[in-house]
Interface confidence: low
């Protein structure tokens, strides 16, 4: 499903929108991106509170969210192959829109180390608790969901849209309705700040169509960092109300004339702006002309000002904004240099960690070290990376290539390895024979044997090893243990039927299998297929089943 209900909060120079709808993180990012934004950043406590506010707005409208816990994607992700860095607040995650490693974090629980698959962060809301502004949503990391598969996705997401500036909401001096349409395609009638390039439709009147007047305004940049609607005087004014309705729409003072008309005014130390509604301080620094962390310093007699930058920054050509000094140009790091606001940070490539001689040096991470290996079986450390391997009888599996999966030799591509019954076990296999037949010394063929009521023959003992020399079973290049990690063979018998020709008779009675010692007591009827052997005895009607285990200790039958 797509993104449904949305809520919006605009503050500072950004708007946050919250959406419900089960999307993967990639789909959510795409949705934000289509409207010119990104999944939201939460770079400070203040920003966390803005995001919480928009979520509170959404949750009050969204009756469908009945689960106790709810999650919403934000723009914090860690790419596949990038490892966790517990020393950083963001733990190696980074914001989708780029930007530095910010100091604020609010992790729900300690993160487990994994470098294998992409991980994404969502805000975890406990809906059973009141959403107090003091209790900010926790960060929860996990899989990023999969497109088109709602079951694996979470309840919603938060977008962030950044703007050059904002206009103040339009002030109505009488009854009317304002509808704002933002550049990110949201309509709202109550925004605390209205983003640059938004449109405002004002319908004046109290719903009586005859009296309704309409006005249309656009939030424009009137001068550098000065944004307004280009309207003059309060809107929807009515002699009937004068200053009594919303203070006449005036920012500060409202002065009423005898005829029901009124004017806006300002308190001492403030001046009325061109919109004839808003008041601004006469102090040149009060409009915060300096940006990017620059401090406004008043000139003599309070007439003009200069901007001053903190350490690690310098004024740009406008003399209003501070830009970071890029210390990385001097190549102070061994591998990666990250320029940070007011400084820099050395980082190591994936597979390396800080260490070694010298400032900013890096050394290889031994991913295979004890207690750290991501591999299920074998792990080989390489310079800057690692690779997993499996013991004989297993192949690499799993989306990240770290797991090992048993190879079923009984259904292998080369056809059955046994002449009669084949039992797959964890990491190996063994052959067996139908009742009345016994396993030949090569551990593969069956020969007619005396009918015996004793127990079936189990795996050959150590002293049997020598008998198998010269067997026709192909050898594998290296040996691996007979049993898998669980230590118990899984017996799934497959019957290779020894026969003289393809039309040899097959007994119609089901074959009752006896469990070999040391294997599970749950058995499946063997499936019967024709062997390719051109000769061999016909299968008898009854008797014992003889079983031998193929060793992988240098004897035949190994993988």
């Amino acid at each position: 499903t797509g993104a449904d209900t949305e809520a919006v909060v605009c503050v500072g120079t950004a708007c946050y929108t919250a959406h419900s709808g089960k999307l993967s993180a990639a789909e959510a990012q795409n949705h934000c991106n289509q409207n010119g934004g990104n999944l939201a950043t939460v770079k400070s406590k203040e920003e966390a509170q803005h995001v919480q506010r928009v979520l509170a707005q959404l949750l009050r409208r969204e009756a469908a969210l009945t689960a106790r816990m709810s999650k919403f994607w934000i723009g914090l992700q860690r790419e596949k192959g990038k490892c966790l860095d517990p020393s950083l607040p963001l733990k190696g995650f980074s914001w989708v829109g780029g930007g530095e490693d910010t100091p604020y974090s609010n992790w729900h629980k300690e993160l487990r180390n994994s470098c294998i698959s992409k991980r994404c962060v969502s805000l975890l809301l406990d809906l059973s608790q009141p959403l107090l502004p003091s209790r900010l949503p926790k960060w929860s990391e996990g899989p990023c969901g999969s497109p088109g598969s709602p079951g694996s996705n979470i309840e919603g997401f938060v977008c962030k849209f950044s703007f050059k500036g904002m206009c103040r909401p339009l002030a109505l001096g009488g009854p009317g309705q304002v509808t704002y349409t933002t550049p990110f395609q949201t309509t709202s009638s109550s925004l605390e700040a209205v983003p640059f390039a938004s449109a405002a439709n004002v319908a004046c009147g109290e719903g009586d169509k005859d009296e309704t007047q309409s006005h249309y305004f656009l939030c424009k940049e009137k001068a550098p960092d000065v944004f307004d609607w280009g309207s003059s005087g309060p809107l929807c004014v009515s002699p009937k109300y004068g200053c009594n309705f919303n203070n006449g729409g005036c920012h500060q003072d409202c002065f009423e004339g005898g005829d029901g008309s009124f004017l806006c005014g300002c308190r001492p130390g403030f001046r009325l702006l061109d919109d004839l509604v808003t008041c601004a301080s006469r102090n040149p620094c009060s409009s915060s002309p300096c940006r990017g962390g620059a401090t406004c310093v008043l000139g003599p007699h309070g007439k003009n000002y200069t901007c001053r930058c903190p350490q690690g920054y310098q004024l740009d050509s406008s003399q209003l904004d501070c830009v970071d000094v890029d210390e990385c140009q001097d190549s102070p790091c061994a591998q990666e240099c990250v320029n940070t606001p007011g400084g820099f940070r050395c980082e190591c490539w994936v597979g390396y960690e800080p260490g070694g001689p010298g400032e900013g040096a890096c050394q290889d991470v031994d991913e295979c070290a004890l207690g750290r290996s991501p591999c299920a079986q074998g792990c080989t450390n390489t310079d800057g990376s690692f690779h997993c391997s499996c013991e004989e009888g297993y192949v690499l599996a799993g989306e990240d290539g770290t797991q090992c999966q048993d190879v079923d030799e009984c259904v292998g591509p080369g056809g059955p390895l046994c002449d009669s019954l084949c039992f797959n076990t964890q990491g190996s296999f063994h052959c067996g024979c139908l009742p009345g037949w016994v396993l030949a010394p090569n551990g593969v063929s069956c020969t007619m044997g005396p009918v015996s009521l004793g127990p079936p023959s189990g795996p050959p003992d150590e002293e049997d090893k020598g008998e198998k020399e010269g067997s026709t079973v192909p050898r594998a290049a290296t040996a691996s243990p007979t049993r898998g990690p669980e230590g118990t063979p899984k017996a799934t018998p497959t019957t290779s039927r020894p026969s003289l020709s393809s039309d040899a008779p097959i007994t119609s009675a089901p074959l009752k299998m006896l469990a070999p010692s040391g294997s599970p007591g749950v058995w499946r009827e063997p499936s019967i297929h024709h062997a390719t052997a051109a000769s061999g005895p016909q299968e008898p009607a009854g008797g014992d089943s003889s079983v031998a285990t193929q060793n992988n200790d240098g004897t035949d039958g190994q993988k």
Partner: antibody
Amino acid sequence: QVQLVESGAEVKKPGASVKLSCKASGYTFTSYWMHWVRQAPGQRLEWMGEIDPSASYTYYNQKFKGRVTITVDKSASTAYMELSSLRSEDTAVYYCARSVYYGNKYFDVWGPGTTVTVSS
Amino acid sequence: DIVLTQSPSSLSASVGQRVTITCRASQSVDYAGDSYMNWYQQKPGKAPKLLIYAASNLESGVPSRFSGSGSGTDFTLTVSSLEDEDFATYYCQQTNEDPRTFGGGTKVEIK
């Protein structure tokens, strides 16, 4: 200066409803939450609920859920609290108070209070 | 609900005396490194007045003889040297969890 002014005292019969008003001035009404707190004679202060005037979102003390309704008129910078199904134990002084929007929502400005008497 | 227990419920003191009032919460009112405990002063027939917010921050305009401390469940309001206008009832309040709750009050009377 910042102030909250409440409506006058009320005398009501059990089972009736009362609607109190609180007019704000001297600050941007939509930038602060508005709360209602009551104090019965000799009792501790009791928080009843709050409203975000910018979007009319409300949170109530579960004790009063269903009986209390908080609303605002943004154009008049006024908050209202209506308490229904009145009983004698609702006799109290009712205060409106504002709190900051974020973080610790302490009550930095209070109205003078309205006395509500419920008596048959 | 978080229950706030104030002690003592009343005390008699003289002008110039140091007074300490305690407030104990039934569970922690700390969250993300902040303590959501506030103190108010109320005089008869008047509305409460904020003195201290977030356990130890003095509200602007409040005399510096008032101070607050504590974290978790135990909090203290101290008046270093009582003045005439300080004889009143003092309430603690937690804003960490809904419903926001108040203590039972401590009445400070003239000895």
